[in-house]
Amino acid sequence: QRFAQAQQQLPLESLGWDVAELQLNHTGPQQDPRLYWQGGPALGRSFLHGPELDKGQLRIHRDGIYMVHIQVTLAICSSTTASRHHPTTLAVGICSPASRSISLLRLSFHQGCTIASQRLTPLARGDTLCTNLTGTLLPSRNTDETFFGVQWVRP
Amino acid sequence: QRFAQAQQQLPLESLGWDVAELQLNHTGPQQDPRLYWQGGPALGRSFLHGPELDKGQLRIHRDGIYMVHIQVTLAICSSTTASRHHPTTLAVGICSPASRSISLLRLSFHQGCTIASQRLTPLARGDTLCTNLTGTLLPSRNTDETFFGVQWVRP
Amino acid sequence: QRFAQAQQQLPLESLGWDVAELQLNHTGPQQDPRLYWQGGPALGRSFLHGPELDKGQLRIHRDGIYMVHIQVTLAICSSTTASRHHPTTLAVGICSPASRSISLLRLSFHQGCTIASQRLTPLARGDTLCTNLTGTLLPSRNTDETFFGVQWVRP
């Protein structure tokens, strides 16, 4: 039992436990650096409890401070490829609404073929998060190598 | 006071706050790529509140979505060592029960001597997590360089 | 509503949701390897809810287990710069009170220009966390590239 009896009547959603973990669905067409995500138990170990997907981008449903994390691994890659194709950069940001557009987290691959990071950030209901991979290197769709998620932490 | 009076009577374990942070105990014998972990206040800053260790591997005691995180640093390592001994790969997965065996998180060292990542994943009571380090490089046992942990996030 | 009605009267602070996300303010003078942090809504997306800043260092206000995370990106950097200036190392630790001084998390840049990691660790009220960057490379102050935060997880 996670809480005392009275609380067990509350749906989990009302407790503010919004959380999502996504796997890579596909990359965009030329000139679109966004990664497109998918999630749900039918797909394996990905899920959405609260947030939703809007055309492959993650939309927040509850105001609060979130832990945002991401890992991206490049599929056709070696240390020399990564440095030769430099800069391959991953940026996670709020892409809509336009008035709130901002980069939240940015990493370059340099001589590696994987980046991973996480951060705390305030997000508001309706914020859509985009993950932009700039460069010419293709990301892996293996679910243990490339993933993106958020966890509601507090109001 | 974390919760209102009525809840302060509940043991923390019933609140579902399962959490563990482990330090490296030792590597396995030849042909066993697993890292063996240890935890407890007597060892420093490692601890287990809910999960348990089973022969150096972490066993989950409560169903839920967990944040799994890991950092591994190679002990005798430079950029050139790391690339010469390439590939050194770390994989975190459910290794038992066999019916639920799956790789959850995978990273290669390439030209670096440290990998660090984290992800959200559903885990069930009885799941045992294994961390496999393949390659010929030895991990550091410094507690600030190599560690592995889980945090229960929601049911 | 995060909790049942009775709890909604409680201030968030009493729920133990201490959390902070900081951005780099400045580096120290010569011989001082510490990074100096700042936070607050006026500065962008950084904030302090519970912990406080003491001369640019983060001071904990509530006992508990915390998730500590950090990302640092070097400003004038390429793979060759990073390896030439090796070792550039980042260490996060408790720097006061002196009796509790300990390194919690340590990473080297090797051939990369960004490090990112996270760990669970017990912290006590009054612990001050310092982030030491040793080496001759300058960190970026871009808020999406360099940040440091803590999140209270459980008592």
Epitope: H26, T27, G28, P29, Q30, Q31, D32, P33, A75, I76, C77, S78, T80, T81, C113, T136, L137, L138, P139, S140, R141, N142 | H85, H86, P87, T89, A91, R106, S108, T134, G135 | -
Partner: antibody, heavy 119, light 108 residues
């Protein structure tokens, strides 16, 4: 049934150009990265070029970089390879091949190949 | 780039016998990103094994792959008449992906 059918091969003089095409059917073409792999008569297989499922990511072997261009048209389920400044050593059977869903360049389906002779 | 060396060049065996094909990489292959293909005359290659040891869809259980790092092996436990062909190894963990030059399994 997954099918890949190459066309456009033939005899060409050194320095000339050729465009190979690969018509895909039996799967959602726009969901898979694709590659061209070649095999000179009696020789080893050699990876030539790859393209991401959306067309935004392209790769080339050093031996063809600057001379060959890979492209795809997801609306027509076709993969193309434009080969310029052809050399004798480009003589080979050219296969189009589908990447595994992971995007990694191992190939679960191959076409029957089209022969390019540079002479 | 990673160079793959296959041995032996030719393997002469009878149906029912066990075939062991070897492939050695000039550098370690990342995370066992290693594949094996079968090619018959006039045909395209066919994927047998990926991930060093996972059989591709529809591949009979007599085919098995093993190995990690720099040494990989394809084993055919009991040769069937349709197994006589050329076998190629491939690494896809490091760019560019590279192939070995093949081992021909012929009827003795």
């Amino acid at each position: 049934e997954v099918q890949l059918l190459e066309s456009g091969g033939g005899l060409v003089q050194p320095g000339g150009s050729l465009r190979l095409s690969c018509a895909a059917s039996g799967f959602t073409f726009s969901s898979y990265a694709m590659s061209w792999v070649r095999q000179a008569p009696g020789k080893c297989l050699e990876w030539v070029s790859a393209i991401g499922e959306g067309g935004g990511y392209t790769y080339y072997a050093e031996s063809v970089k600057g001379r060959f261009t890979i492209s795809r048209d997801n609306s027509k389920n076709t993969l193309s390879l434009l080969m310029n400044s052809l050399r004798a050593e480009d003589t080979a059977v050219y296969y189009c091949a589908r990447h595994d869903y992971s995007n990694y360049p191992y190939f679960d389906y191959w076409g029957q190949g089209t022969l390019v002779t540079v002479s | 780039e990673i160079v793959l060396t296959q041995s032996p060049g030719t393997l002469s065996l009878s149906p029912g016998e066990r075939a062991t094909l070897s492939c050695r990489a000039s550098q370690g292959v990342r995370s066992s990103y290693f594949a094996w293909y079968q090619q018959k005359p006039g045909q395209a290659p066919r994927l047998l094994i990926y991930g060093a040891s996972t059989r591709a869809t529809g591949i009979p259980a007599r085919f098995s792959g093993s190995g990690s790092g720099t040494d990989f092996t394809l084993t055919i436990s009991r040769l069937e008449p349709e197994d006589f062909a050329v076998y190629y190894c491939q690494q896809y963990g490091s760019s560019p992906p590279t192939f070995g030059c093949g081992t021909k399994v012929e009827i003795k």
